[in-house]
């Protein structure tokens, strides 16, 4: 903590500008008015302050706002955001998507830090649910964001938000997460026609039950093997050879390459050899 010292004559800062980079830490503490800093936060980013100087500026804001910064200040924190601790951020009330975007921009290109995770958590809890605009923003900055949420947290995603989800946003989701997301996606895309529906629902199918896979098999969807391999084993096992053949269409010959991988292996073992032989792939049940 910086010791309290009087500001030398003529050094009082009338505004936040480049001249402050030549101030020692104690001079910044003594000569920069915290209220002035708060109103001119947008200027701080344009000035090449050292990390030590930024520490002083943060300290001044902390003193001015012991209960947490107002959103007008938070929105213009810029690189000063990197100095904040999760404890600092828990005091904030961030409601504007623009504020969220501004702070995520500061951390862009980096892994999600504890600060960012706390910020997002505060923002989403404040909104009460993961609406489409928020999800759009978060997945744009962090494609893996959705899959970092627990199934419980995902349950607060409204079906309307599913339209913002891109296939790559689901890359790291596990089956438990897809179990929660799939019914929402099914609801969101229910009014689409067959082929368009399959394109949209494909990434969520790791959460699909057997009856939905049976229904898809009647729609000439030609599911690829990568998608088939991501299906729940318990959902695949009851499918007949004829249903799998219809589901995969021309991709059915790909079963041969994956005959020892789950869920293909487990499915093969459940089938009658006579039925498997109709595929002409040499699969051994």
């Amino acid at each position: 903590e910086v010791e309290k010292t009087a500001c030398p004559s003529g050094k009082k800062a009338p505004e936040i500008d480049e001249s402050l980079i030549f101030y020692k830490k104690w001079e910044l503490e003594a000569c920069v008015d915290a209220a002035l800093l708060a109103t001119q936060m947008d200027r701080v980013n344009a000035i090449p302050f050292t990390y030590e100087q930024l520490d002083v500026l943060k300290h001044k804001l902390d003193e001015l706002y012991p209960q947490g910064y107002p959103e007008s200040v938070i929105q213009h924190l810029g690189y000063l955001f990197l100095k904040m601790s999760p404890e600092d951020i828990r005091k904030w009330n961030v409601t504007s998507l623009e504020t969220l975007k501004a702070l995520l921009e500061v951390n862009k290109g980096h892994e999600m830090s504890p600060q960012v995770a706390t910020l997002i958590d505060r923002f989403v809890k404040g909104r009460g649910q993961l609406d489409k605009d928020t999800l759009d923003t978060l997945t744009a900055f962090y494609p893996g964001y959705l899959c970092s949420l627990s199934p419980e947290e995902l349950s607060s995603v409204p079906p309307s938000s599913i339209w913002a989800v891109r296939p790559q946003d689901l890359d790291t989701c596990d089956p438990r997460q897809l179990d929660v997301l799939y019914p929402k996606a099914r609801l969101a895309f229910q009014n689409m026609n067959g082929s368009e529906y399959f394109v949209k629902i494909q990434s969520f199918l790791g959460g699909a039950p057997t009856e939905d896979l049976k229904a898809l098999s009647q729609q000439n969807v030609s599911m690829d093997l990568a998608t088939f391999m991501k299906l729940r084993t318990d959902a695949v096992l009851p499918l007949t050879v004829a249903e799998v053949q219809k589901l995969l269409g021309p991709h059915v010959e790909g079963l041969k390459a994956e005959e020892r991988h789950r869920p293909v292996r487990d499915w093969i073992l459940r089938q009658r050899q006579d039925d498997l032989d109709t595929l002409g792939l040499g699969l051994q049940g």
């Epitope: 890359d171 990568a226 991501k230 041969k256 390459a257 789950r262």
Partner: antibody, heavy 119, light 108 residues
Framework: EVQLQQSGPELVKPGASVKIPCKAS????????MDWVKQSRGKSLEWIGD????????IYNQKFEGRATLTVDKYSSTAYMELRGLTSEDTAVYFC????????????WGTGTTVTVSS | QLVLTQSPAIMSASPGEKVTLTCSAS???????LSWYLQKPGSSPKLWIY???NLASGVPARFSGSGSGTSYSLTISSMEAEDAASYFC?????????FGGGTKLEIK
């Protein structure tokens, strides 16, 4: 551009283990299988096994079963091959290779990692 | 395991010459499950031909592949200097997947 980047050469002692990373870029790692292939000096290629990155399910050539372990970190898009109980016979170049799920051919190969087992 | 035998092990060809490399399987392989790879010294292998006769992306049209059952071949209609490399056949019809011993093709 699709790339599989492997680490540099490894010199290891007999009996030790080696873990080789294969960093995938330019595509979604969970949409393809990742296979591993051994090439001893001046010799042919030998299939070690493969892993489906989405669920981590791996299968092995019986010759390497119990000594090789194939894993994937989906978050960093990196596949790994660990080989234990190394002997001079394991001195070779090891390649990771992408395989389109549902096919058996390798359309993209890693840069290769040379492993030398010597005391 | 299914054994693939390539012949000849080493061969050289003059520019413009027609070249045929063969791959013989110890038991029948469906044509879908047979591919060829090219490898130059110090480099990784490259997919060259898949499903017996399909050329991989960027492979010159002078290359072709054919065969069925236990007998497969890769043909270069007119040898060029850049074709000098080792060629390996590969099957994924049965586990473990196996490769042939390779043919080293040199330019005269």
């Amino acid at each position: 551009e699709v790339q599989l980047q492997q680490s540099g050469p490894e010199l290891v002692k007999p009996g030790a283990s080696v873990k080789i990373p294969c960093k995938a870029s330019g595509y979604t790692i969970t949409d393809y299988n990742m296979d591993w292939v051994k090439q001893s000096r001046g010799k042919s290629l030998e299939w070690i096994g493969d892993v489906f990155p989405y669920n981590g399910d791996s299968i092995y050539n019986q010759k390497f079963e119990g000594r090789a372990t194939l894993t994937v970190d989906k978050y960093s898009s990196t596949a790994y091959m660990e080989l234990r109980g190394l002997t001079s016979e394991d001195t070779a170049v090891y390649f990771c290779a992408r395989r389109k799920t549902g096919t058996g051919y390798f359309d993209v190969w890693g840069t290769g990692t040379t492993v030398t087992v010597s005391s | 395991q299914l054994v693939l035998t390539q012949s000849p092990a080493i061969m050289s060809a003059s520019p413009g010459e027609k070249v045929t490399l063969t791959c013989s399987a110890s038991s029948s392989v469906s044509s879908t499950y047979l591919s060829w790879y090219l490898q130059k010294p110090g480099s990784s292998p490259k997919l060259w031909i898949y499903s017996t006769s399909n050329l991989a992306s960027g492979v010159p049209a002078r290359f072709s592949g054919s065969g069925s059952g236990t007998s497969y071949s890769l043909t270069i209609s007119s040898m060029e200097a850049e074709d000098a490399a080792s060629y390996f056949c590969h099957q994924w019809s049965s586990y473990p997947y196996t490769f042939g011993g390779g043919t080293k093709l040199e330019i005269k």
